[in-house]
Amino acid sequence: TFFQKPESCPPVPGGSMKLDIGIINENQRVSMSRNIESRSTSPWDYTVTWDPNRYPSEVVQAQCRNLGCINAQGKEDISMNSVPIQQETLVVRRKHQGCSVSFQLEKVLVTVGCTCVTPVIHHVQ
Amino acid sequence: TFFQKPESCPPVPGGSMKLDIGIINENQRVSMSRNIESRSTSPWDYTVTWDPNRYPSEVVQAQCRNLGCINAQGKEDISMNSVPIQQETLVVRRKHQGCSVSFQLEKVLVTVGCTCVTPVIHHVQ
Protein backbone atom coordinates (compact mmCIF):
# COMPACT_ATOMS: atom_id res chain seq x y z
CA THR A 1 0.00 0.00 0.00
CA PHE A 2 0.89 3.70 -0.14
CA PHE A 3 2.43 3.80 3.34
CA GLN A 4 4.54 0.64 3.07
CA LYS A 5 8.22 0.61 2.17
CA PRO A 6 9.34 -1.24 -0.97
CA GLU A 7 9.57 -5.02 -0.36
CA SER A 8 13.36 -4.96 -0.72
CA CYS A 9 13.63 -2.57 2.27
CA PRO A 10 13.61 -3.47 5.99
CA PRO A 11 10.14 -3.17 7.56
CA VAL A 12 9.04 -0.03 9.43
CA PRO A 13 9.78 -0.37 13.19
CA GLY A 14 6.76 -0.50 15.49
CA GLY A 15 4.23 0.03 12.71
CA SER A 16 4.91 3.75 12.39
CA MET A 17 6.36 6.06 9.76
CA LYS A 18 8.20 9.36 9.66
CA LEU A 19 5.99 12.41 9.23
CA ASP A 20 7.91 15.59 8.43
CA ILE A 21 6.96 18.66 10.42
CA GLY A 22 5.35 21.46 8.44
CA ILE A 23 2.45 21.51 6.02
CA ILE A 24 2.90 22.26 2.33
CA ASN A 25 0.61 25.18 1.28
CA GLU A 26 -0.47 25.65 4.90
CA ASN A 27 -1.62 29.22 4.28
CA GLN A 28 -3.79 28.31 1.28
CA ARG A 29 -7.33 29.56 1.88
CA VAL A 30 -10.74 29.00 0.31
CA SER A 31 -11.88 32.14 -1.52
CA MET A 32 -15.53 31.44 -2.20
CA SER A 33 -18.03 34.04 -3.38
CA ARG A 34 -19.48 35.97 -0.46
CA ASN A 35 -22.39 34.51 1.54
CA ILE A 36 -23.16 31.81 -0.98
CA GLU A 37 -24.74 29.75 1.81
CA SER A 38 -27.54 32.30 2.20
CA ARG A 39 -27.77 33.40 -1.46
CA SER A 40 -28.09 29.83 -2.76
CA THR A 41 -31.41 28.46 -4.00
CA SER A 42 -30.55 25.54 -1.67
CA PRO A 43 -29.33 27.55 1.35
CA TRP A 44 -27.40 26.01 4.22
CA ASP A 45 -26.12 26.76 7.72
CA TYR A 46 -22.77 25.84 9.23
CA THR A 47 -22.03 23.86 12.38
CA VAL A 48 -18.48 23.96 13.74
CA THR A 49 -17.01 20.99 15.59
CA TRP A 50 -13.88 21.58 17.66
CA ASP A 51 -11.37 18.97 18.80
CA PRO A 52 -7.97 20.04 20.19
CA ASN A 53 -6.47 16.61 19.37
CA ARG A 54 -7.39 16.85 15.70
CA TYR A 55 -5.75 18.83 12.89
CA PRO A 56 -7.46 20.89 11.73
CA SER A 57 -9.05 21.38 15.17
CA GLU A 58 -12.05 23.07 13.58
CA VAL A 59 -14.17 21.10 11.12
CA VAL A 60 -17.15 22.87 9.60
CA GLN A 61 -20.22 20.89 8.54
CA ALA A 62 -22.95 22.35 6.33
CA GLN A 63 -26.62 21.48 6.82
CA CYS A 64 -29.20 22.23 4.13
CA ARG A 65 -31.87 24.55 5.47
CA ASN A 66 -34.82 23.38 3.38
CA LEU A 67 -36.13 20.19 1.85
CA GLY A 68 -37.12 21.96 -1.36
CA CYS A 69 -35.35 24.85 -3.13
CA ILE A 70 -35.99 28.60 -3.00
CA ASN A 71 -37.30 30.15 -6.22
CA ALA A 72 -36.77 33.66 -7.60
CA GLN A 73 -39.74 34.91 -5.55
CA GLY A 74 -38.15 33.66 -2.33
CA LYS A 75 -40.75 30.91 -1.99
CA GLU A 76 -40.00 27.24 -1.56
CA ASP A 77 -40.37 25.14 -4.70
CA ILE A 78 -41.19 21.59 -3.58
CA SER A 79 -40.83 20.21 -7.09
CA MET A 80 -37.06 20.47 -6.52
CA ASN A 81 -34.83 19.05 -3.75
CA SER A 82 -32.02 20.60 -1.74
CA VAL A 83 -29.25 18.02 -1.39
CA PRO A 84 -25.94 18.07 0.46
CA ILE A 85 -22.63 17.98 -1.41
CA GLN A 86 -20.19 15.78 0.47
CA GLN A 87 -16.45 15.36 0.39
CA GLU A 88 -14.12 12.87 2.03
CA THR A 89 -11.26 14.67 3.74
CA LEU A 90 -8.27 13.65 5.87
CA VAL A 91 -7.62 14.95 9.35
CA VAL A 92 -4.77 14.08 11.72
CA ARG A 93 -5.50 12.60 15.13
CA ARG A 94 -2.97 13.27 17.92
CA LYS A 95 -2.39 10.59 20.55
CA HIS A 96 -0.13 11.20 23.50
CA GLN A 97 1.08 9.40 26.56
CA GLY A 98 3.40 11.69 28.45
CA CYS A 99 6.19 12.80 26.12
CA SER A 100 5.44 10.09 23.58
CA VAL A 101 3.32 11.69 20.86
CA SER A 102 2.12 9.92 17.73
CA PHE A 103 -0.27 10.86 14.96
CA GLN A 104 -2.76 8.95 12.87
CA LEU A 105 -4.72 9.86 9.77
CA GLU A 106 -8.51 9.76 9.90
CA LYS A 107 -11.00 9.96 7.06
CA VAL A 108 -13.90 12.35 7.74
CA LEU A 109 -17.02 12.92 5.66
CA VAL A 110 -17.74 16.64 5.38
CA THR A 111 -20.87 18.25 3.96
CA VAL A 112 -19.49 21.29 2.17
CA GLY A 113 -22.70 22.92 0.97
CA CYS A 114 -25.94 22.17 -0.82
CA THR A 115 -27.22 22.20 -4.37
CA CYS A 116 -30.68 22.17 -5.91
CA VAL A 117 -31.58 19.11 -8.00
CA THR A 118 -34.47 17.73 -10.00
CA PRO A 119 -35.78 14.79 -7.96
CA VAL A 120 -35.38 11.16 -8.95
CA ILE A 121 -38.10 10.05 -6.56
CA HIS A 122 -41.21 12.12 -6.10
CA HIS A 123 -42.00 11.60 -2.41
CA VAL A 124 -44.06 14.79 -2.51
CA GLN A 125 -46.25 15.88 -5.40
CA THR B 1 1.67 24.24 17.41
CA PHE B 2 -0.37 21.07 16.99
CA PHE B 3 2.58 18.92 15.91
CA GLN B 4 5.06 20.05 18.56
CA LYS B 5 5.71 18.17 21.78
CA PRO B 6 4.95 19.87 25.11
CA GLU B 7 7.73 22.32 26.08
CA SER B 8 8.79 20.14 29.01
CA CYS B 9 9.60 17.27 26.61
CA PRO B 10 12.80 16.75 24.61
CA PRO B 11 12.54 18.07 21.01
CA VAL B 12 11.60 15.81 18.11
CA PRO B 13 14.76 14.41 16.41
CA GLY B 14 15.38 15.54 12.83
CA GLY B 15 12.19 17.57 12.61
CA SER B 16 9.95 14.56 12.10
CA MET B 17 7.18 12.83 14.03
CA LYS B 18 5.72 9.36 14.36
CA LEU B 19 2.78 8.63 12.05
CA ASP B 20 0.96 5.41 12.89
CA ILE B 21 0.19 3.10 10.01
CA GLY B 22 -3.49 2.65 9.21
CA ILE B 23 -6.28 5.17 8.61
CA ILE B 24 -9.23 5.54 10.96
CA ASN B 25 -12.55 5.15 9.03
CA GLU B 26 -10.61 4.25 5.88
CA ASN B 27 -13.64 2.57 4.28
CA GLN B 28 -15.97 5.52 4.79
CA ARG B 29 -17.38 6.49 1.39
CA VAL B 30 -19.39 9.31 -0.14
CA SER B 31 -22.55 7.98 -1.81
CA MET B 32 -21.66 9.11 -5.34
CA SER B 33 -24.24 7.11 -7.29
CA ARG B 34 -26.69 9.97 -7.06
CA ASN B 35 -25.74 11.91 -10.23
CA ILE B 36 -26.35 15.18 -8.45
CA GLU B 37 -23.76 16.82 -10.69
CA SER B 38 -26.02 16.39 -13.74
CA ARG B 39 -29.37 16.83 -11.96
CA SER B 40 -28.33 20.11 -10.31
CA THR B 41 -29.62 23.48 -11.52
CA SER B 42 -25.91 24.44 -11.38
CA PRO B 43 -24.47 21.29 -13.02
CA TRP B 44 -20.78 20.45 -12.99
CA ASP B 45 -18.23 18.10 -14.53
CA TYR B 46 -15.38 16.27 -12.82
CA THR B 47 -11.68 16.22 -13.63
CA VAL B 48 -9.53 13.58 -11.95
CA THR B 49 -5.90 14.25 -11.11
CA TRP B 50 -3.66 11.27 -10.34
CA ASP B 51 -0.39 11.28 -8.41
CA PRO B 52 1.16 8.01 -7.19
CA ASN B 53 3.16 9.88 -4.52
CA ARG B 54 0.06 11.42 -2.96
CA TYR B 55 -2.56 9.88 -0.67
CA PRO B 56 -5.24 9.78 -1.84
CA SER B 57 -3.65 9.30 -5.27
CA GLU B 58 -6.87 10.39 -6.97
CA VAL B 59 -8.18 13.91 -6.32
CA VAL B 60 -11.39 14.92 -8.06
CA GLN B 61 -12.05 18.55 -8.98
CA ALA B 62 -15.45 19.87 -10.05
CA GLN B 63 -15.98 22.60 -12.67
CA CYS B 64 -19.32 24.38 -13.04
CA ARG B 65 -20.72 23.77 -16.51
CA ASN B 66 -22.54 27.09 -16.89
CA LEU B 67 -22.26 30.69 -15.76
CA GLY B 68 -26.01 30.88 -15.17
CA CYS B 69 -28.35 28.23 -13.74
CA ILE B 70 -30.60 25.77 -15.52
CA ASN B 71 -34.33 26.48 -15.20
CA ALA B 72 -37.28 24.06 -15.22
CA GLN B 73 -37.36 24.21 -19.03
CA GLY B 74 -33.72 23.10 -19.23
CA LYS B 75 -32.59 26.51 -20.46
CA GLU B 76 -29.84 28.64 -18.93
CA ASP B 77 -31.12 31.48 -16.76
CA ILE B 78 -28.46 34.20 -16.71
CA SER B 79 -30.24 36.14 -13.97
CA MET B 80 -28.80 33.53 -11.58
CA ASN B 81 -25.20 32.38 -11.15
CA SER B 82 -23.61 28.94 -10.87
CA VAL B 83 -20.80 29.20 -8.32
CA PRO B 84 -18.21 26.64 -7.13
CA ILE B 85 -18.21 25.33 -3.57
CA GLN B 86 -14.67 24.84 -2.34
CA GLN B 87 -13.15 22.91 0.52
CA GLU B 88 -9.65 22.76 1.99
CA THR B 89 -8.53 19.17 2.38
CA LEU B 90 -5.36 17.43 3.52
CA VAL B 91 -3.40 14.97 1.42
CA VAL B 92 -0.19 13.11 2.28
CA ARG B 93 2.89 13.55 0.11
CA ARG B 94 5.37 10.64 -0.04
CA LYS B 95 9.08 11.42 -0.40
CA HIS B 96 11.63 8.67 -0.82
CA GLN B 97 15.34 8.33 -1.29
CA GLY B 98 16.14 4.65 -1.55
CA CYS B 99 14.77 2.89 1.53
CA SER B 100 14.32 6.12 3.46
CA VAL B 101 10.65 7.07 3.11
CA SER B 102 9.05 10.06 4.79
CA PHE B 103 5.66 11.71 4.51
CA GLN B 104 4.44 15.27 4.66
CA LEU B 105 0.99 16.78 4.88
CA GLU B 106 -0.17 19.11 2.13
CA LYS B 107 -3.19 21.37 2.02
CA VAL B 108 -5.15 21.14 -1.23
CA LEU B 109 -8.06 23.27 -2.37
CA VAL B 110 -10.82 21.12 -3.88
CA THR B 111 -13.90 22.33 -5.76
CA VAL B 112 -16.52 19.86 -4.61
CA GLY B 113 -19.53 20.96 -6.65
CA CYS B 114 -21.58 23.98 -7.59
CA THR B 115 -24.64 25.79 -6.29
CA CYS B 116 -27.03 28.28 -7.83
CA VAL B 117 -27.08 31.74 -6.22
CA THR B 118 -28.82 35.06 -6.64
CA PRO B 119 -26.15 37.45 -7.91
CA VAL B 120 -24.77 40.25 -5.76
CA ILE B 121 -23.96 42.39 -8.78
CA HIS B 122 -25.97 42.07 -11.95
CA HIS B 123 -23.23 42.14 -14.60
CA VAL B 124 -25.72 40.72 -17.11
CA GLN B 125 -29.29 41.94 -17.43
Partner: nanobody, 123 residues
Protein backbone atom coordinates in the same frame (compact mmCIF):
# COMPACT_ATOMS: atom_id res chain seq x y z
CA UNK C 1 -24.25 4.01 13.79
CA UNK C 2 -27.61 5.81 14.09
CA UNK C 3 -29.87 4.43 16.83
CA UNK C 4 -33.61 5.00 16.39
CA UNK C 5 -36.35 4.31 18.92
CA UNK C 6 -39.98 4.85 17.89
CA UNK C 7 -42.90 4.90 20.34
CA UNK C 8 -46.50 6.02 20.73
CA UNK C 9 -48.29 3.53 18.49
CA UNK C 10 -51.63 2.12 19.64
CA UNK C 11 -55.02 0.81 18.60
CA UNK C 12 -57.47 3.68 17.94
CA UNK C 13 -60.90 4.20 16.42
CA UNK C 14 -61.23 5.82 12.99
CA UNK C 15 -61.27 9.60 13.43
CA UNK C 16 -59.03 9.35 16.51
CA UNK C 17 -55.58 10.82 17.15
CA UNK C 18 -52.11 9.61 18.12
CA UNK C 19 -48.72 11.18 18.69
CA UNK C 20 -45.66 9.18 17.69
CA UNK C 21 -42.17 9.95 19.02
CA UNK C 22 -38.76 9.06 17.68
CA UNK C 23 -35.50 9.40 19.60
CA UNK C 24 -32.42 9.48 17.38
CA UNK C 25 -28.85 9.14 18.59
CA UNK C 26 -25.55 8.85 16.73
CA UNK C 27 -26.52 11.36 14.05
CA UNK C 28 -23.60 13.06 12.31
CA UNK C 29 -23.05 16.81 12.33
CA UNK C 30 -24.21 16.96 8.73
CA UNK C 31 -27.52 15.17 9.36
CA UNK C 32 -30.05 17.44 7.76
CA UNK C 33 -33.52 15.91 7.80
CA UNK C 34 -35.56 13.20 9.49
CA UNK C 35 -38.44 11.26 8.04
CA UNK C 36 -41.39 9.11 9.06
CA UNK C 37 -42.14 6.04 6.96
CA UNK C 38 -44.76 3.31 7.25
CA UNK C 39 -45.25 -0.27 6.16
CA UNK C 40 -48.73 -1.76 5.96
CA UNK C 41 -49.15 -5.57 5.95
CA UNK C 42 -48.15 -7.00 2.56
CA UNK C 43 -47.06 -3.61 1.23
CA UNK C 44 -43.74 -1.87 0.69
CA UNK C 45 -42.43 0.68 3.12
CA UNK C 46 -43.45 4.19 2.04
CA UNK C 47 -42.55 7.77 2.85
CA UNK C 48 -44.97 9.67 5.10
CA UNK C 49 -43.34 12.94 6.17
CA UNK C 50 -40.00 14.72 6.48
CA UNK C 51 -38.63 17.64 8.46
CA UNK C 52 -35.47 19.76 8.22
CA UNK C 53 -33.59 19.99 11.53
CA UNK C 54 -32.60 23.60 10.89
CA UNK C 55 -35.68 25.32 9.50
CA UNK C 56 -38.42 22.94 10.62
CA UNK C 57 -39.50 22.86 6.97
CA UNK C 58 -41.89 19.89 6.50
CA UNK C 59 -43.15 17.82 3.58
CA UNK C 60 -45.91 15.19 3.52
CA UNK C 61 -47.12 12.49 1.20
CA UNK C 62 -50.49 13.43 -0.36
CA UNK C 63 -52.57 10.91 1.57
CA UNK C 64 -51.71 12.45 4.97
CA UNK C 65 -51.62 16.16 4.10
CA UNK C 66 -53.79 18.21 6.43
CA UNK C 67 -54.14 15.34 8.91
CA UNK C 68 -50.55 14.63 10.03
CA UNK C 69 -48.07 17.16 11.43
CA UNK C 70 -44.38 16.46 11.90
CA UNK C 71 -42.32 18.46 14.41
CA UNK C 72 -38.88 18.23 15.99
CA UNK C 73 -36.99 19.04 19.18
CA UNK C 74 -33.38 19.78 18.24
CA UNK C 75 -32.08 19.78 21.82
CA UNK C 76 -33.48 16.31 22.50
CA UNK C 77 -32.74 15.08 18.96
CA UNK C 78 -36.35 13.86 18.77
CA UNK C 79 -39.02 14.08 16.09
CA UNK C 80 -42.76 13.63 16.45
CA UNK C 81 -45.72 12.78 14.25
CA UNK C 82 -49.08 14.16 15.32
CA UNK C 83 -51.75 12.05 13.59
CA UNK C 84 -55.34 13.31 13.48
CA UNK C 85 -58.50 12.11 11.70
CA UNK C 86 -56.98 8.64 11.45
CA UNK C 87 -58.35 6.24 8.83
CA UNK C 88 -58.19 2.43 8.64
CA UNK C 89 -55.77 2.81 5.70
CA UNK C 90 -53.28 4.46 8.08
CA UNK C 91 -52.82 1.08 9.80
CA UNK C 92 -49.14 0.18 9.57
CA UNK C 93 -45.88 -0.08 11.44
CA UNK C 94 -44.41 3.45 11.58
CA UNK C 95 -40.64 3.99 11.41
CA UNK C 96 -38.48 7.08 11.64
CA UNK C 97 -35.08 7.49 10.02
CA UNK C 98 -32.36 9.99 9.20
CA UNK C 99 -32.73 11.39 5.67
CA UNK C 100 -29.10 12.27 4.88
CA UNK C 101 -30.02 13.52 1.40
CA UNK C 102 -33.36 15.05 2.37
CA UNK C 103 -36.16 14.18 -0.03
CA UNK C 104 -33.52 12.81 -2.40
CA UNK C 105 -32.82 9.86 -0.06
CA UNK C 106 -33.77 6.53 -1.63
CA UNK C 107 -35.26 3.64 0.35
CA UNK C 108 -32.46 1.33 -0.83
CA UNK C 109 -29.88 3.58 0.84
CA UNK C 110 -31.05 2.71 4.35
CA UNK C 111 -28.93 0.17 6.15
CA UNK C 112 -30.53 0.36 9.54
CA UNK C 113 -34.15 0.70 10.76
CA UNK C 114 -35.52 0.82 14.29
CA UNK C 115 -38.14 -1.64 15.50
CA UNK C 116 -41.00 0.70 14.54
CA UNK C 117 -44.25 1.32 16.37
CA UNK C 118 -47.57 -0.31 15.44
CA UNK C 119 -50.56 1.91 14.62
CA UNK C 120 -53.89 0.13 14.15
CA UNK C 121 -56.98 2.08 13.16
CA UNK C 122 -60.26 0.19 13.52
CA UNK C 123 -63.44 1.18 11.75
Amino acid sequence: QVQLVESGGDLVQAGGSLRLSCAASGLTGSSYAMGWFRQAPGKEREFVAAISWISGDTKYTDSVKGRFTMSRDNAKKQVYLEMNSLKPEDTAVYYCNDMPYGLDTRMDEYVYWGQGTQVTVSS
